[in-house]
């Protein structure tokens, strides 16, 4: 029988009559055109629709969109198209939603060919309602909030301007023209790349990187030869064109520009590209794209000034056609990541670190789960899971990994169990202690979704027919009810519920269709009833984030520290609540080489958790770039993980001395970096 | 081997207090928790609460909750349970028991290694 | 909390016997149950958990099964060293003790 459906599994009781209380339908009243929806704030219940239905004519496409509001989850929707003067709204732009609960919305619409401007609509009482702006400009960009103040906000124009508003757009000036690409740092900083000559295209490598930090009042130029920069963590990066070819290198910066540092990453070439993983306040994930069409590169892990960079993994998936990878970040675990490598006989297979990238192994077989037939041996063989790269080759996969902060532990995915990705038609399993172990949890393809911090588990089957039930979990996945939602099948096109996975309400989303007509239909569903009672204290139980090895007197220890947390027991059927937090417990550990990552020079043989030089390297001096010095590195081979807590135990130590000569790299240097005023 | 020593036998006044103590040697003490469970006479076995070493997480059992205090010291790597307002009720044979753990789960495992129980008597 | 409940609370057997004992708990407990066996004057010993792992060093005469809120533990051949009293214990929730079978010579 398929997971959970036996007859021993814990039913929830009366459980249909309390769903069926709770369950909430709405038909849009529209033509099926496309449909996109947009929680709005924290924990208001606010919900914007917008439906749109395009009209191909022989000249332009003509449009009608609709808008519509709920404020209660979902349960209700109000249609205020009138609102945007029924204006149709172009989808590209999406619904421009404001930081944490400003209530600020930013909708950008279709207009006439002549105009001299874009129009957009404007609200910041959570969509109750809206201004209309007409724009100085034609945006090509989606209206950028900044992180700090919501007021302001900044857009890209057709003709490559970069326009900024300090009163949430309602006035608008130009600040710079030529403008490629354009993000907000910290603290209302704006960084830029700009051209001067040609356009984006024709001038990339010779771009130059530009900061405000007074809104455009004054700028300052940070680098030169620029192809391209991000932001992540606390790290500014930058690709710089090389003097003497077209290679490229990346430069780091930690003070938002005012200094840089060469990576010790490899240069790369034309059709070679550098990806941020992930990035944090403490390190950075750098993908390093192989030379050649291969679709696999490496993975490097920086230390805490994103300057050296160990190798993490070889041979790491990503696509230079469609740009997929499937790196995952498991949020509910903390040093775990999940992605793709390509083996050398071009099968694809899941790797996962619980270090931070320290080391990467197989995930392990699920239990009760035979191989498959891209098993070699049908004893050993380990998980595989479908992310990113499966779904944009059309597999049968609804979804990518899901895992959320506040649910602990857990990890749900569509996966085989082979000895590669297979093609066959794949299961959905779940793993309640971060990656480390796994169980099938449903057979065949599933829309799944996480509510009250783990609480419920909700999923429905991923098929071409229309469907009207619905299949939920109140013990992280073991055992499953089923409730009929509708007598009606629906095409089922998308379970919706409020990011954070806080919420006990989820949206069911889909259309039907009759002869003459066919209509939007949402059923919201609340499960409050379910879960009938506040979690109390007997509810949870103490468990030790990874765990291997309870002899081990360092056992769980990951960074330095390890964790203890409260979690709720499976057999528990409670609300966590959305005031839920999770209680956690993190006490240091003693440092071993573990601890250490391998500095510039130095790797790590497989299976060894020493340090040793790197052959090529045996006798020479380590040179490298920092802050546009050369330094000279005296090391025995180790530096510390970043975020790496431990104390005392094994400590190789490391220094860097000052050589005063200055760097071979075409970048700037502070003193050749300039201030411009408005 | 991992043993559980117990402290040896009591004899108490009504409304008095006793301390067990539960001291483990040959094993790693701190990375399992340490439940208590009492056994009166000719009657079965009744969970008090436990701890878990690290962090000094305890729970209790309803029943004894705000009667019984259970500590852990990872120095020596031992175990206290205090009982106070004793009763002739509470007249057992109090053992201590190692949780089994194959996962970072505490308390999911049994209780693999046991102490030799300690007889507290309550009377007056 | 969860309640065990455990039968027979006495169980009349002999050498060689297959035997049998049950416990059912309030609530789904998924697998998180163990069985103990305890003898006069000595400490309880662990026998299964998880439902139905055996312990090491248990011999294989004894096995478990169950799962939810319906739990067995089986005595495939009864020994002359299996008459004791046996317990199953609950894990999932707060630590509950079924009330005991006890196993003595027919």
């Known amino acids: 029988s398929a997971p959970g459906e036996d007859e021993e599994c814990g039913r929830v009781r009366d459980f249909v009559a309390k769903l069926a209380n709770n369950t909430h339908q709405h038909v849009f009243d529209d033509l099926r055109g496309s449909v996109s929806l947009s929680w709005v704030g924290d924990s208001t219940g606010v919900i914007l629709v917008l439906t749109t239905f395009h009209v191909p004519l022989v000249i332009m496409t003509f449009g009608q969109s609709k808008l519509y509001r709920s404020e209660d989850y979902g349960k209700n929707f109000k249609d205020i198209t009138d609102l945007i003067n029924n204006t149709f709204i172009r989808t590209e732009f999406g619904m421009a939603i404001g930081p944490e609960n400003s209530g600020k919305v930013v909708l950008t619409a279709e207009v006439s060919g002549g105009s001299r401007g874009g129009r957009i609509f404007r609200s910041s009482d959570f969509a109750k309602n809206f201004v209309q702006t007409d724009l100085p400009f034609h945006p090509l960009t989606q209206m950028m909030y900044s992180p700090q103040n919501s007021d302001y906000l900044l857009a890209l124009s057709t003709e490559n301007g970069l326009w900024v508003s300090k009163n949430f757009g309602g006035k608008w000036e130009e600040i710079h023209k030529a403008v490629c690409l354009a993000k907000w740092g910290s603290d209302n900083t704006i960084f830029f790349t700009t051209y001067a000559n040609g356009s984006c295209k024709a001038d990339l490598g010779a771009l130059e990187l530009w900061r405000t930090s007074d809104l455009g009042k004054s700028f300052k130029t940070i680098g030169v030869k620029i192809y391209s920069f991000g932001l992540g963590g606390r790290f500014l990066f930058a690709s710089v064109m090389a003097d003497k070819d077209t290679t490229r290198r990346i430069h780091v910066s930690t003070d938002q520009g005012d200094t840089w540092s060469m990576a010790q990453l490899p240069s790369v070439g034309q059709e070679q590209f550098y990806s941020i993983l992930a990035a944090n306040d403490d390190m950075v994930f750098m993908h390093v794209d192989e030379p050649g069409d291969t679709g696999f590169g490496t993975i490097f892990t920086s230390d805490d000034r994103g300057i050296v960079y160990s190798k993490s993994l070889d041979r790491h998936l990503y696509t230079t056609t469609g740009g997929e990878t499937d790196f995952t970040n498991v949020t509910s675990l903390r040093g775990v990541y999940i992605t793709s490598v390509l083996s050398e006989d071009n099968s694809i297979q899941t790797m996962i670190t619980f270090d931070q990238g320290g080391r990467w192994t197989h995930l392990r077989k699920p239990e009760n789960s035979e191989c498959d037939a891209t098993a070699k041996n049908k004893n050993e063989c380990s998980l595989h899971i479908h992310a990113s790269y499966s779904i944009s080759q059309k597999l049968n996969v609804p979804m990518a990994p899901l895992s959320e902060p506040n649910a602990v532990g857990i990890v749900i995915a569509h996966g085989s169990v082979g000895d590669a990705i297979s093609v066959m038609v794949p299961d959905v399993y779940i793993s309640d202690d971060g990656g480390y172990s796994w169980t099938k949890m449903l057979e065949g393809p599933h829309y799944y979704t996480i509510l009250d911090s783990g609480g419920i588990i909700v999923a429905i089957e991923h098929s071409s027919r229309p469907i009207n039930v619905i299949k939920f979990s109140t013990d992280e996945g073991q055992c499953w009810q089923t409730y009929t939602f509708t007598r009606d099948p629906i095409y089922f096109t998308g379970l919706a519920s409020e990011p954070g996975a806080r919420s006990m309400n989820i949206s069911i989303w889909g259309f039907t269709e009759s002869f003459a007509t066919s209509q939007w239909v949402s059923y919201t569903i609340d499960f409050k009833d379910i879960l009938e009672r506040n979690c109390e204290e007997k509810d949870y139980t103490i468990w030790l984030a990874h765990s291997t090895d309870p002899e081990d007197y360092e056992d769980g220890c990951i960074l330095g520290y390890k964790e203890q947390f409260l979690r709720l027991r499976k057999s528990s059927v409670c609300q966590n609540g959305r005031d839920y937090v999770v209680t956690k417990q993190p006490s240091i550990c003693l440092c071993s080489l573990e601890d250490f990552l391998c500095d510039f020079g130095y790797y790590r043989p497989e299976n060894d958790s020493k340090c040793v030089e790197q052959p090529e390297l045996k006798g020479h001096d380590l040179e490298f770039c920092l802050y546009g010095r050369e330094e000279h590195l005296t090391t025995n081979g180790y530096r510390k993980i970043p975020g790496d807590k431990c104390q005392g135990g094994v400590n190789p130590v490391r220094e860097v001395k000052d050589l005063k000569k200055k760097c071979t790299s075409n970048f700037l240097s502070p003193e050749k970096q300039n201030s411009k005023s408005n | 081997q991992v043993q559980l020593v117990q402290s040896g036998a009591e004899v108490k006044k009504p409304g008095s207090s006793v301390k067990v103590s539960c001291k483990a040697s040959?094993?790693?003490?701190?990375?399992?928790?340490i439940s208590w469970v009492r056994q009166a006479p000719g009657q079965g076995l009744e969970w008090m609460g436990g701890?878990?070493?690290?962090?000094?997480?305890?729970n209790y059992a309803q029943k004894f909750q705000g009667r019984v205090t259970i500590t852990a010291d990872e120095s020596t790597s031992t175990a206290y349970m205090e009982l106070s307002s004793l009763r002739s009720e509470d007249t057992a044979v109090y053992y201590c028991a190692r949780q089994g753990r194959k996962t970072g789960y505490y308390y999911y495992y049994g209780m693999d290694v046991w102490g030799q129980g300690t007889t507290v008597t309550v009377s007056s | 909390d969860i309640q065990m409940t455990q039968s027979p609370s006495t169980l009349s057997a002999s050498v060689g016997d297959r035997v049998t004992i049950t416990c059912r708990a309030s609530?789904?407990?998924?697998?998180?149950l163990a069985w103990y066996q305890q003898k006069p004057g000595k400490a309880p010993k662990l026998l299964i958990y998880?439902?139905?792992s055996l312990e090491s060093g248990v011999p294989s005469r004894f096995s478990g099964s169950g799962s939810g809120t319906e739990f067995t533990l089986t005595i495939s051949s009864l020994q002359p060293d299996d008459f004791a009293t046996y317990y199953c214990q609950q894990a999932d929730g707060h630590i509950t003790f079924g009330g005991g079978t006890k196993v003595e010579i027919k």
């Open positions: 701890i878990i070493p690290i962090g000094g997480w305890a």
């Open positions: 040959g094993g790693t003490f701190r990375n399992y928790a």
């Open positions: 998880k439902a139905s």
């Open positions: 609530q789904s407990i998924s697998s998180w």
